[in-house]
Interface confidence: medium
């Protein structure tokens, strides 16, 4: 004598006041879990959204963004305009990254170049609007005599002859 309403399967809802206890979800609606009192309206992928997965009686539609936009938020709840590499999106549209900053993606904000000197390194490749700087070895590492071609021989322990 199970509580049948609580056991209506996914894809149905408890329509207990009619002749059936569980009724199939109407068109353009779904229930992804059992025991639902109502079915949820299917998401519609319109405008800047495009359909990635159609709605079924047991699962909601899934949306992507049309070309030139990218998804933001859980389950692609928003579409944000793409910018070019070397740009960031502002309220006034896409703007070039300021000097000293870069963005290597079509989304997100411009970030400052890495400060190589903070790690005691030198700039090997200069940064651009699209690319971060590449840090190289520190100037000290490059000075003559700083590195030896042959590593020093290990010290022998006293009382042991070489093998």
């Amino acid at each position: 004598l199970q509580d049948l309403c609580s056991n209506c399967p996914a894809g149905t809802f408890c329509d207990n006041n009619r002749s059936q206890i569980c009724s199939p979800c109407p068109p353009n609606s779904f229930s992804s879990a059992g025991g639902q009192r109502t079915c949820d309206i299917c998401r519609q992928c319109k405008g800047v959204f495009k359909t990635r997965k159609e709605c079924s009686s047991t699962s909601n539609a899934e949306c992507d963004c049309i070309s030139g936009y990218h998804c933001l938020g859980a389950e692609c709840s928003m579409c944000e305009q793409d910018c070019k590499q070397g740009q960031e999106l502002t309220k006034k549209g896409c703007k070039d990254c300021c000097f000293g900053t870069f963005n290597d993606q079509k989304r997100g904000i411009c970030r400052p170049w890495t400060n190589c000197s903070l790690d005691g390194k030198s700039v090997l490749v200069n940064g651009t609007k699209e690319r971060d700087v590449v840090c190289g070895p520190s100037p000290a590492d490059l000075s003559p005599g700083a590195s030896s071609a042959t590593p020093p021989a290990p010290a022998r322990e006293p009382g042991h002859s070489p093998q």
Epitope: L1, Q2, L4, C5, N16, N17, R18, Q20, I21
Partner: antibody
Framework: QSLEESGGDLVKPGASLTLTCTAS?????????MCWVRQAPGKGLEWIAC????????PHYASWAKGRFTISQTSSTTVTLQMTSLTAADTATYFC??????WGQGTLVTVSS | AQVLTQTPSSVSAAVGGTVSISCQSS???????FSWYQQKPGQPPKLLIY???TLASGVPSRFKGSGSGTQFTLTISDLECDDAATYYC????????????FGGGTEVEFK
């Protein structure tokens, strides 16, 4: 948590009787699926009706019981079964149950002239 | 109304043995709304299995429910003396009238 049936009696054919299922430790203002089942002496189980407590949902009935038997929630601790036009065939122990997992001990109804 | 035909009506078993009880429904049970109950004389029924194969709380794993649609089986293995009882199947149907039906019962006794 427990259920106790009461109201069972010896009645004459054609009489009416109301059985009460009283719950301890269960609040029927919340949603529970409460059922009545009967068992004639030496016979098997026979489902009568079920109701959602704390709800206006349609009760569920056996076709033979609909119209003559009425299940209802009468308080936050009681569910009743009203029976009319009783005949000898209604002689049985009447059980109430919560979703099949919790049962009362039953109350005996005897219909005899 | 739906009819559940339970077979056999009685079975004589040996301690440590296995018994199987079948239940056939005149209509397909909806979404595995199917249960098995155990009843001993002078006691109310006790839920053993629900949703066709899910063991109720506190019921030993010697009890196993299987089946779907119109055909269901209860298997009791490693039988103990305490298993002597009458077993009932119950089916649930997707209608507000005749929502449930019980099988006629199977009495399990020991040789």
């Amino acid at each position: 948590q427990s259920l106790e049936e009461s109201g069972g009696d010896l009645v004459k054919p054609g009489a009416s009787l109301t059985l009460t299922c009283t719950a301890s430790g269960i609040d029927f203002s919340r949603r529970y699926y409460m059922c009545w089942v009967r068992q004639a002496p030496g016979k098997g189980l026979e489902w009568i009706a079920c109701i959602y407590t704390g709800s206006r949902d349609t009760p569920h009935y056996a076709s033979w019981a609909k119209g003559r038997f009425t299940i209802s929630q009468t308080s936050s601790t009681t569910v009743t079964l009203q029976m009319t036009s009783l005949t000898a065939a209604d002689t049985a122990t009447y059980f109430c149950a919560r979703e099949g997992s919790l049962w009362g001990q039953g109350t005996l109804v005897t219909v005899s002239s | 109304a739906q009819v559940l035909t339970q077979t056999p009506s009685s079975v004589s078993a040996a301690v440590g043995g296995t018994v199987s009880i079948s239940c056939q429904s005149s209509q397909s049970v909806y979404s595995n709304w199917f249960s098995w109950y155990q009843q001993k004389p002078g006691q109310p029924p006790k839920l053993l299995i629900y949703s066709a194969s899910t063991l109720a709380s506190g019921v030993p794993s010697r009890f196993k429910g299987s089946g779907s649609g119109t055909q269901f089986t209860l298997t009791i293995s490693d039988l103990e003396c305490d298993d002597a009882a009458t077993y009932y199947c119950a089916g649930g149907y997707n209608t507000v009238i005749d929502t449930f039906a019980f099988g006629g019962g199977t009495e399990v006794e020991f040789k």
